[in-house]
């Protein structure tokens, strides 16, 4: 699985990585002005786990299981 993955929050992450086989999902999250793009585990694609792992109380997130599916426009749909 390929995901956009930037180590630190960035407005427009364009770094694509081949996720390790442990990861079966891509995540994009917006918390305030912070946008996170990550390789993720689908079992953690729920509000509680995303907020806990990102130390953010309010956010919007989108998980998907296709290559490079975690781009900004997904959060606007």
């Amino acid at each position: 699985l390929q995901c956009y993955n930037c180590p630190n929050p960035t407005a427009d992450c364009k770094t694509a990585v081949n996720c390790s086989s442990d990861f079966d999902a891509c995540l994009i999250t917006k918390a305030g002005l912070q946008v996170y793009n990550k390789c993720w585990k689908f079992e953690h694609c729920n509000f509680n786990d995303v907020t806990t792992r990102l130390r953010e109380n309010e956010l919007t997130y989108y998980c998907c299981k296709k290559d490079l599916c975690n781009f900004n426009e997904q959060l606007e749909n």
């Epitope: 180590p7 770094t15 996720c19 442990d22 990861f23 585990k41 792992r53």
Partner: antibody, heavy 121, light 107 residues
Framework: EVQLLESGGGLVQPGGSLRLSCAAS????????MSWVRQAPGKGLEWVSY????????HYPDTVKGRFTISRDNSKNTLYLQMNSLRAEDTAVYYC??????????????WGQGTLVTVSS | DIQMTQSPSSLSASVGDRVTITCRAS??????LAWYQQKPGKAPKLLVY???TLAEGVPSRFSGSGSGTDFTLTISSLQPEDFATYYC?????????FGQGTKLEIK
Amino acid sequence: EVQLLESGGGLVQPGGSLRLSCAASGFAFSSYDMSWVRQAPGKGLEWVSYISSGGGSTHYPDTVKGRFTISRDNSKNTLYLQMNSLRAEDTAVYYCARDGYYAEYYVMDYWGQGTLVTVSS
Amino acid sequence: DIQMTQSPSSLSASVGDRVTITCRASENIYSYLAWYQQKPGKAPKLLVYNAKTLAEGVPSRFSGSGSGTDFTLTISSLQPEDFATYYCQHHYGSPLTFGQGTKLEIK
């Protein structure tokens, strides 16, 4: 304050079994992945197991696969490591560690003080 | 499995020195690299993750850099409490592996 307290170590004969426990406090245990890492006397660090927050996924290196089983009881805030068919090379201090620092998987930000397992006849 | 190789295995330095420790991965791990410090008889302490992000409470004299396969941990001005063993660890995915460690000793 985050605290991880390991117990259950001791002397065991080759081929024997042991169950380690790690009691967690000071954080929402059920929301965090956890790992066990060991360190043989005078040697470096070796990761031995991982379990996701809900227990749905576990991972092991080949050196312990099939012999060690990681589990957790989120109602008791406790992590376990069941070790079977123990070998002399399993002798080490075993640390439990909280996994998942910020948005990262497999980064361990809090560690217990360790429990010593000695495998010897 | 991804192999992590640290160099040097040991290093003597003095208080105030600038010190660099190197870690090399056997394959591309992007920026998925962490550094830990361990003092004798103590548990490891997280210093850096994502190759260059300092963990909470870590002094700014520590810095990490690199991506892909080659990484460094730099201590800009050694303090007495920095004499310890340092380990790198990739966090790209399981199995997790550590470098063999670099023991930093007082000259």
